[in-house]
Amino acid sequence: QFLKEGQLAAGTCEIVTLDRDSSQPRRTIARQTARCACRKGQIAGTTRNKPSCVDARIIKTKQWCDMLPCLEGEGCDLLINRSGWTCTQPGGRIKTTTVS
């Protein structure tokens, strides 16, 4: 089972674009676009801070932490109104991700 050039294996993703804006002090805003080849019942999401294919129910219910989006050892919390999630590092630093 050979993949054509540019073709992704089923269930995998790749980062297409990554834009960073560090103009604001102590704050970096990153916008990432990924390309995924998800199986039936899956949809593009984030697992361990990388693009991945996740159970579509997670996106529908906005239970973002069920994607396991944070790195090991980080705590995941939903934002108010489930517009995204935060990953809290053991040292207390918080990374916020909003879904658009």
């Epitope: 199986r39 361990r48 239970q63 932490c65 069920d66 995941c76």
Partner: antibody, heavy 120, light 107 residues
Framework: QVQLQESGPGLVKPSETLSLTCTVS????????WSWIRQPPGKGLEWIGY???????NYNPSLKSRVTISVDTSKNQFSLNLKSVTAVDTAVYYC??????????????WGQGTTVTVSS | DIQMTQSPSSLSASVGDRITISCRAS??????LNWYQQTPGKAPRLLIY???TLQSGVPSRFSGGGSGTDFSLTITSLQPEDFATYYC?????????FGQGTKLDIK
């Protein structure tokens, strides 16, 4: 180092409910998926289901009408309830951690297993 | 459901031998395949995930390969502790299904 420990009665009467608990130590239950697997005497492994940090679940359709998996994050525990048991539910029951290695979900930490016999 | 079929069901070999166990999926699962080892009275142990990636702490004499529907687990230079039952498991769909197992014993 994460360790899992199953607990619950070793003998359950037919038609009753089998209840097991898996206690997770050495790590947070909120950072992974968790699973139950069983193995009847002398046979192979059967996947029972998953639970996600939020409490959402995925079950084996062959058991779906009888099984409930729940999580208690405050106690770092997740549980299995299997109702209306019969002799065919006699098995060693394992709990396991499900690790997303990139795109590949695998059960990388297992409890030692607990034997449940269904008999009157 | 995806069916996983292992062959052979049992296998006899000697210390130092090289052996290969096969696993076939009833439909394509890309490389979403895991291998486990189980010794009597013990819980299964993850050996390989993603068809070919060795789990941390697993000796390099174990290797996995394949994609789509056909997979293999190879052990080079068998050691006494390798005599056990081996299971493949797909992680591409619900329900997760295991192969029926391959029992490896000493010739």
């Amino acid at each position: 180092q994460v360790q899992l420990q199953e607990s619950g009665p070793g003998l359950v009467k037919p038609s009753e409910t089998l209840s097991l608990t898996c206690t997770v130590s050495g790590g947070s239950i909120s950072s992974y998926y968790w699973s139950w697997i069983r193995q009847p005497p002398g046979k192979g492994l059967e996947w029972i289901g998953y639970i996600y940090p939020s409490g959402s679940t995925n079950y084996n359709p062959s058991l779906k009408s009888r099984v409930t998996i729940s999580v208690d994050t405050s106690k770092n525990q997740f549980s299995l309830n299997l109702k209306s048991v019969t002799a065919v539910d006699t098995a060693v029951y394992y709990c396991a951690r499900v690790n997303p290695f990139g795109y590949y979900y695998a059960m990388d930490v297992w409890g030692q297993g607990t034997t449940v016999t269904v008999s009157s | 459901d995806i069916q996983m079929t292992q062959s052979p069901s049992s296998l006899s070999a000697s210390v130092g031998d090289r052996i290969t166990i096969s696993c076939r999926a009833s439909q394509s699962i890309s490389t979403s395949l895991n291998w486990y080892q189980q010794t009597p009275g013990k819980a299964p142990r993850l050996l390989i995930y993603g068809a070919s990636t060795l789990q941390s702490g697993v000796p390099s004499r174990f290797s996995g390969g394949g994609s789509g529907t056909d997979f293999s687990l190879t052990i080079t230079s068998l050691q006494p502790e390798d005599f056990a039952t081996y299971y493949c498991q797909e992680s591409a769909s619900i329900p997760r299904t295991f192969g029926q197992g391959t029992k490896l014993d000493i010739k």
